[in-house]
């Protein structure tokens, strides 16, 4: 199976966006890009800011196919990858080469996936085998997490209340949300 380096036991292979070849709008929305959602106590450092939303890390995109055994998605997909160091957004421009990356002297900051979205993927198989479908998860946005010097490297501390979110960073699913309020989410879930 392809992309072994990116797969764990949850088999989070990246789906094809054949139905929607453009990058999903939610990934281009400034409200979800380059910020940590929700409030909380900011870390103590020389550039301390009262607004957690000012903390930023880079969200990169790259393209690849989904494979599952001999089956492969018809088109390559664009996946969001959380990368780079975290720091106050005003010192951490998205445009590479514009300013210096901010380095905290005390706590260690990590850019990690914040929200995921799920998608059913149609995979085409050789030899006349019937198309198969898989459900996979995509990173929808990134956020900064803080690791203090007093904690083990594996224990990442959230800026705010993100840790209380459900598994995989998904919000609890509504049964009857208004269409208007969720139009963007509806339009790009696949």
């Amino acid at each position: 199976q392809g992309w072994q380096a990116f797969k764990n036991d949850a088999t989070e292979i990246i789906p094809e966006l054949g139905e929607y070849p453009e990058p999903p709008p939610e990934l281009e929305n400034n409200k979800t890009m380059n910020r940590a959602e929700n409030g909380g106590r900011p870390p103590h450092h020389p550039f301390e800011t009262k607004d957690v939303s000012e903390y930023s890390c880079r969200e990169l995109h790259f393209t690849r196919y989904v494979t599952d055994g001999p089956c492969r998605s018809a088109k390559p997909v664009t996946e969001l990858v959380c990368s780079g160091q975290c720091g106050p957004a005003r010192l951490l421009p998205n445009a590479i080469g514009r300013g210096k990356w901010w380095r905290p002297s005390g706590p260690d900051f990590r850019c990690i996936p914040d929200r995921y979205r799920a998608q059913r993927v149609q995979l085409l198989c050789p030899g006349g085998e019937a198309p198969r479908a898989r459900k996979v998860r995509l990173v929808a946005s990134c956020k900064c997490k803080r690791l203090t010097r007093f904690h083990n490297q594996s224990e990442l501390k959230d800026f705010g209340t993100e840790a209380a979110r459900p598994q995989k960073g998904r919000k609890p699913r509504p049964r009857a949300r208004s269409a208007k309020a969720n139009q963007a989410e509806l339009e790009n879930a696949y």
């Epitope: 088999t11 998608q119 059913r120 198969r132 459900k135 699913r173």
Partner: antibody, heavy 118, light 107 residues
Framework: QVQLQQPGAELVKPGASVKLSCKAS????????MHWVKQRPGQGLEWIGM????????NYNEKFKSKATLTVDKSSSTAYMQLSSLTSEDSAVYYC???????????WGQGTLVTVSA | SIVMTQTPKFLLVSAGDRVTITCKAS??????VAWYQQKPGQSPKLLIY???NRCTGVPDRFTGSGYGTDFTFTISTVQAEDLAVYFC?????????FGGGTKLEIK
């Protein structure tokens, strides 16, 4: 509010075909897979297949591949399932359901009871 | 196809009791399991997704857990309105399959 509307019942003769409808409202119809699920009286749930309204691409449970044909009409935001060569085994309630984020079948129609009888 | 084996088939309990339903997948499905409640004469309703995430509006007495092949659905304190059939479903690969259902009856 997301709604999937299905007719209440269909009475059909053995050997005939029936085309079930599922009219969607309250969300962007073309953005989500639509699923069809069968439930025989007093029994469990069986997934028949799914269709993506945007592309028309579909995926079937092999068991129903020769029985069901899924289509959509984007202009009316309606999904259809045609069942052919009906027998008493096909008497069941048929539900349409959509994903709304692919986290499970979040929204279901009320179901159409298909009765196959001479 | 992935087979979901759900037990027990029937549960007769009193209001206030704790109820546990289990589902075993024939192969690993990660945490891609959903739980549904179907009340008499109604369509199924999604309660839990990703094995443990409760849908908005679903009372917190309903919980789910598990990963891989073994999954559990629990009602901590059964209430009269919980009379229904409960189904598990693997949401990992097609054909998406359901457990046989557990009929919960209240004494």
């Amino acid at each position: 509010q997301v709604q999937l509307q299905q007719p209440g019942a269909e009475l059909v003769k053995p050997g005939a075909s029936v085309k079930l409808s599922c009219k969607a409202s309250g969300y962007t119809f073309t953005s989500y897979w639509m699923h069809w699920v069968k439930q025989r009286p007093g029994q469990g749930l069986e997934w028949i297949g799914m269709i993506h309204p945007n592309s028309g691409s579909s995926n079937y449970n092999e068991k129903f591949k020769s029985k069901a044909t899924l289509t959509v009409d984007k202009s009316s935001s309606t999904a259809y399932m045609q069942l052919s060569s009906l027998t008493s085994e096909d008497s069941a309630v048929y539900y349409c359901a959509n994903d709304y984020d692919d986290e499970g079948f979040a929204y279901w129609g009320q179901g159409t009871l298909v009765t196959v009888s001479a | 196809s992935i087979v979901m084996t759900q037990t027990p088939k029937f549960l007769l309990v009193s209001a206030g009791d704790r109820v546990t339903i289990t589902c075993k997948a024939s192969q690993s499905v990660s945490n891609d399991v959903a739980w549904y409640q179907q009340k008499p004469g109604q369509s199924p309703k999604l309660l839990i997704y990703y094995a443990s995430n409760r849908c908005t509006g679903v009372p917190d007495r309903f919980t789910g857990s598990g990963y891989g092949t073994d999954f559990t659905f629990t009602i901590s304190t059964v209430q009269a309105e919980d009379l229904a059939v409960y189904f598990c479903q693997q949401d990992y690969s097609s054909p998406w399959t359901f457990g046989g259902g557990t009929k919960l009856e209240i004494k």
